[in-house]
Every structure is written in C-alpha cells, then in structure tokens.
Amino acid sequence: ELDTPKDLQVSETAETSLTLLWKTPLAKFDRYRLNYSLPTGQWVGVQLPRNTTSYVLRGLEPGQEYNVLLTAEKGRHKSKPARVKASTEEVPSLENLTVTEAGWDGLRLNWTADDLAYEYFVIQVQEANNVETAHNFTVPGNLRAADIPGLKVATSYRVSIYGVARGYRTPVLSAETSTGTTPNLGEVTVAEVGWDALTLNWTAPEGAYKNFFIQVLEADTTQTVQNLTVPGGLRSVDLPGLKAATRYYITLRGVTQDFGTAPLSVEVLTEDLPQLGGLSVTEVSWDGLTLNWTTDDLAYKHFVVQVQEANNVEAAQNLTVPGSLRAVDIPGLKADTPYRVSIYGVIQGYRTPMLSTDVSTAREPEIGNLNVSDVTPKSFNLSWTATDGIFDMFTIEIIDSNRLLQTAEHNISGAERTAHISGLPPSTDFIVYLSGIAPSIRTKTISTTATTEALPLLENLTISDTNPYGFTVSWTASENAFDSFLVTVVDSGKLLDPQEFTLSGTQRKLELRGLITGIGYEVLVSGFTQGHQTKPLRAETITAMGSPKEVIFSDITENSATVSWRAPTAQVESFRITYVPITGGTPSMVTVDGTKTQTRLVKLIPGVEYLVSIIAMKGFEESEPVSGSFTTA
C-alpha cells in the first residue's frame, strides 16, 4: 500500500497565493496529485512530478478558505490523501482620508488602514489648477498621518494616497483642500528686564513659522550686539549678556521656507547695576543686633555680612545668608562694644558694592533701685529699675529674717517694674531678693529689707491739760480700724466706781471733767472692731492745778516790760510772777489777781536779760511754773 505524503503544510499565505510544503513518502510512487477546492465549490487538480516537495497555488481569491488534498500515485494505485486547510490574506485597504489645514503653508493628512504590515504609503500633492506641480512623498507604512509642509499660501490642492503591502498596491484615495492665508506676527513685549538681561515675549499663530530671527541693537550706537535665530515653536527667549542702564532696540521677524514677516520692534532700557541700599540696624541688644537692608527685587544668590569690633579688626566674623533674606539676626556679640557691620550681595557672579554701618551693642542688662513702699501689716509694694525690653521675667524671693516662714517666690513679667507682695504676717522683718531673667542671662541678685506694719494698734495714750477737776485723754489709732473706743477711768485707790465712756471709732480724745482734785487716776483705752476688743492702753495722772501757758513779753523799755500769759482752764485765785537777771541777783516777785493775764514789770536794769517764771495759786496749792526770758533795751 502506498504511503501518504508526510507533513503537508502551508508555509506562506498571500492575498492571491498559498505556498505548500511536504515530505516524500517512503514507498515508491510515480507522481503526486494535488487537488484544492475553489470558493465556488469546484475542485481543481494538478499532477506533480515525484521529486516535488513544494508547490505555490496562484490566482487565488483574497480572504478565502481553501481545502488542499495531496495523494501519491503508482499506476492505478493511490495513497490516502494528506489534507490541509488555509486562507488567503485579506486585500489591504485605505479609508477615511481627511485633510486639514496645517498652518498657512502646509496640510495635515490623516487616514485609516487595516492592521497589515504596510511597507509604505505614497502621497501625491498637486495644485488643483496646475497638474504639472505634482509632488510625491513616500512615508513609512506604520504611519496613519503626515504633514505636507512648504505649500503655497491660500492655494487649492488635490491630495492622493495609496498603500503598498507585500507588493500589493491599494486603491487610491483622494481629497481636495486649501492652505490657509498668510500668518501675521502678533505683538512683541519685554518682560523681566534686569541689569544684564531681559526676556522677550511675542505672539504668533501656532505652526506658522519655521523660526524667528531676533536682532538686538544698542539704541545710542545703532551697533548690532546680538543676532539670533530661534525655533518657530518658541514664543519667548532670554537675552543675556547686556549692559546695565543701556537702551536697546530689539526687532523680531518670523521666517518660513519662502517667506519672512515684516519686523516687530520694541525699545527697552536695562536696569541699573544691582546695589544694596538702606542698611540699618534695628533691635540692638546687649549681646546681638538685627541687620536690615533693602535691595532691588532681584534674585540674589546670597549676601555676605561681616561683623567686626571697631577697635579690634582681627575679631571679624563673616556670615553668609540666603539671597531671599533682607534681615538677619547677629547674636553672640559683646555687651557695650562698638562694631562695624558690612554687607554685600552676590548675584550672577556679580558682587555689589559693600555697605557699612557702625553700631554699639547695649550695656549688659541691669536691675537696680529696689525700693519698698506702701507698707501695711500684711503687704508692701516693690519697685525697681531695669534695662528696658530685655527681661522675660523677674524673680522675687521673700524670706523672713528669722527664717520661720517658708520662702515665697514670685515670677513677674519682664515688662513690670513694680510688684505687690501680700499675704504676709504683721510686724515681721523680710529680706527681698530680686533678679532678672533674659534669654541668655540671669542678673546678679539685688536685695532690700522690709518690715510689715504692726496690726492696727491703739498707741500714744497721753494725758494733757491736767487741772484740779479733770484732764484730757488722747490717743492715736489707725484710720477706719475701729468701730468704737471704750475709755475707763478708775481712781487709784479704787474707792469710787469706774467711769466708762464709749466713743465712736473716729474720736481720738476725751475731755474728762468733774473729777476730784489732787488724787491719782488710771485711764484705760481699748478699741472694738466687729466685736473684738483690743488690749487696753494704760496711763496714770493726778488731778492738780493747771499751769499758765504761753508767756509773751511786750512794750520792753530800758527799765520796764509787760508780761502776758494764758490762764489755765480751771479758775485760780492768783498768779505769782518771779523775775531775776540771768546773771544772778535777788529775785523780784509780783502777785496779781487770778482774773488777770498780764502785768508790768518795773525798776529793771537796762540791757540785762531777765528770766521770768509764773505760777498759778489756789489756797495752799501751786501749779507747775511756766517760764520765759527777755532783755531790756
């Protein structure tokens, strides 16, 4: 029996052909018969020599399926057929050709094509009214769009395209369109004018120009200083390398392949060279300062600040600060020291002229003049002086001298110069310590002493105007401290009932009358506050004759003078006046009626100083004397 041909397969497919391959069978045979079906259902047969191992079916229809049978024959014997099924390739096709205006001197083509491996596309462009002007372009097979530049302005064109895939050429697609009108340059402006550069901006239609030509002239010399060509896609360009404070004339042209626009021009003045200005020192403290400066609004790379002691140029420190700053704090300086502070800026490799200023740091913060005022039994006020604007806080320590109380510490705002210290015990000695605290310093401590007042006491009980029938009691007391006073009067022998007098809290004295002459009395005064009684003050006296008062001399001559006095409150029988020269001698005496308050002294020696004493008398009682002196003419 004959072998079937081996490994029948389709090795290549094309739109109109299929390539078959197979292997020779082992058994001997004379020939092959190849049969394949047509789309119509018919079979076509081909006889092939025995040494054939491949065959190309040609003239097939694209995109159709074919059945292939291959048998080996020997005489009338046939092998079983080898079978294979295969389809021819689809015919490549182009569709949807669209042409859009690509600016005023070009067109843009878009098309669709099936996903075949196109080798290339052929595009033909010709003026609709001039067939001789045809241009052919070949573009790669992977593209589905193409720009056709270099056309005439406002011209009708016929555009055709076909594709080539595996040697097969698609049908041609065609379209008609027109290019746009000539573009115009818009406006040209200058932005970001610096001292050595500027930025040129302009407007123009998109895709209109191949490039732009820019010419820069110095306006005063008309000398061209720069020519440059930039791509047509740009709308802005930086022009560096200019001179400071110079007027420039700049022109701009748009350029196409065969066309240049009319130039647009602009005139501009570059800025002055950058320089620093307004160097000032603010917030000078004792250990630092703040430096401020002004500059033109340029992008400085950095500033270099140099600080040196005015009297010690070797002690210089340099500080580089970012170009965005216009102020810098310079710490770590010496107090009360003159400094020279300098600064320059660095911008695009250019170093501005240096600015300098002289400044002295403040004296080291000080506190002083710690004073105590407004002392009460439980509080006092403190005041002090201090360097302004330095201290964050003051610390006040209050320690009682006997160290019996817990130390009180008060922290007070650095803006304050006074403090009210309260809640203290009365009649207590205190030591007050004050120190100031600033960010980097605590001052030496200063101190003072303070003593709280005693509680409101009754004080200074005195007895005055003693006379035979009474006396005046007076005392001192704190204002508004007492609701009432109790005055108790007891005779020393405790023979009589005590007399009690209740007085208002505003009174400070009591005149006692109707007492017995010549006996001792004890007086007790105590105060009441909200029902609380003070311990009493005590005083003792004896009722007696009141003394005359206020001796006055008048009408003095060589040998006489008048003496006057004020009589005591109680009635007396008489006054005895004794007078004698101060240098010595026999005293002279005059007695006058108790109703009189003056008498004439006679038979005196000229130019002599006399000592005069006056006593009041009643029965056998004599008052204490009152004295005075005068000198005759």
């Epitope: 009460t376 039994p377 439980k378 009365p426 009649s427 007042e453 005693a454 509680l455 409101p456 006491l457 704190s478 401290a481 609701d483 009432s484 109790l486 009441f528 506050t529 909200q530 029902g531 609380h532 009684q533 003070t534 311990k535």
Partner: antibody
Framework: EVQLLESGGGLVQPGGSLRLSCAAS????????MSWVRQAPGKGLEWVSA????????YYADSVKGRFTISKDNSKNTLYLQMNSLRAEDTAVYYC???????????WGQGTLVTVSS | SSELTQDPAVSVALGQTVRVTCQGD??????ASWYQQKPGQAPVLVIY???NRPSGIPDRFSGSSSGNTASLTITGAQAEDEADYYC??????????FGGGTKLTVL
C-alpha cells in the same frame, strides 16, 4: 430670743452658682454686723465674709474674693451669700453668725451644707 | 497656713484643770474669743474680750492673754466639756481669723 436659720444649700456642679440665705429674728437686724463662716467636712472653721449693720461695708476672705458676694436686706431681716464659680474646695457647712458691738460672733445658725461635685 | 496656731489635741482627766492655747501676731493687739463646738452642732461663744463669759457659760471657763498668746482655761473639766475649741481674732484688714482648732478629750 435670737434665732438664725440658714437655707439654700445643696449639690451643685463645679463652676455653678448657689445663693444662701440666713433669716434672722429676735434682734434689730439693721444694727448688727453679720458674718458667714464655713467648715469643710472634718476640718476647722474658716471665716468667709462679713458685712456691716447698714450693709455699706463688706469684707471677704482671699479664697472667695471675686466669686462670692455678701449682702443683707434689712427690710426682710435676711442675710445672703451669692456664690459663683464654685469649686470642689468650697464644699462645706456654711454658718451665718451675728456680731455685737463688743461681742464677736455671739450667735450662730445651725448651718446649711453646700456640696460642689460633678 | 493659719494666722492663729493651736495644738491639735489636748486631754484632761475629769475634774482636772486644762489650758488650751492659741498663738498669733494679732493677739498682741486684740483679745481672743473662744468657741466650743460639739459634733454635729454649731459653734458656741464661751469667752470674749479680756475674760468675759456670755450668759449661760459656766464660770469654770476663763480666759487670759499675754503677749502673742491667748489661753482658755477650764477649771474642773466636766464630761460635757469634751469638744473642739477654736480661738478667733481679727487681722489688720478686719478679716476674722480662726485657729485650726483643738480637740479636747476628757478622760
């Protein structure tokens, strides 16, 4: 017979307010100064505030100054204590007491309990 | 801290004499007042001024003063005298001041 009767105590939250009253009888109310004294549980007596007979002068302990207000209505023979911004440490029995010109705190009421708690 | 200082506790045998003391700067100027307080009751004034007793207070209670110290003396203490005793005075700002109290135990 002198009688003093406090009222108005109770439970209040911290920061709250309370008004205590003390009804007086048996004496000429307008002639005498009055005081409030408090006693925290298990603690000693603490004077709180005082007012003169006419009501013209008032006195306060530092611990309540600015928060408590003492007043008296002589026409109603009543003493008041307005307590604002109450704190836990204000918890106590509050007594009202009478003061004579020469005798301190001679008569006391039986007290009213104020509890400040959340 | 209180402006008047008292001993926290004192004890006395029945019938014996006991002295309760109070110290403070205000006592240099003012006489102390003394109050007795029994559990659950309001305080009662027992001594005021130099040595004054309100009516109804037994004469076994007496007061004295020296310097910055005031004393309350109970001569012949009775069981019913067991109580807390508070001294009281007035300070410079017319504020009443109380001592911390003394617990008296009668044995």
């Amino acid at each position: 017979e002198v009688q003093l009767l406090e009222s108005g105590g109770g439970l209040v939250q911290p920061g709250g307010s309370l008004r205590l009253s003390c009804a007086a009888s048996g004496f000429t109310f307008s002639s005498y100064a009055m005081s409030w004294v408090r006693q925290a549980p298990g603690k000693g007596l603490e004077w709180v505030s005082a007012i003169s007979g006419s009501g013209g002068s008032t006195y306060y302990a530092d611990s309540v100054k600015g928060r408590f207000t003492i007043s008296k209505d002589n026409s109603k023979n009543t003493l008041y204590l307005q307590m604002n911004s109450l704190r836990a440490e204000d918890t106590a029995v509050y007594y009202c007491a009478k003061t004579s010109p020469r005798v301190p705190l001679d008569y006391w009421g039986q007290g009213t309990l104020v509890t400040v708690s959340s | 801290s209180s402006e008047l200082t008292q001993d926290p506790a004192v004890s006395v045998a029945l019938g014996q004499t006991v002295r309760v003391t109070c110290q403070g700067d205000s006592l240099r100027s003012y006489y102390a007042s003394w109050y007795q307080q029994k559990p659950g009751q309001a305080p009662v004034l027992v001594i005021y001024g130099k040595n004054n007793r309100p009516s109804g207070i037994p004469d076994r209670f007496s007061g004295s003063s020296s310097g910055n110290t005031a004393s309350l003396t109970i001569t012949g203490a009775q069981a019913e005298d067991e109580a807390d005793y508070y001294c009281n005075s007035i300070n410079s700002t017319r504020n009443e001041v109380f001592g911390g109290g003394t617990k008296l135990t009668v044995l």
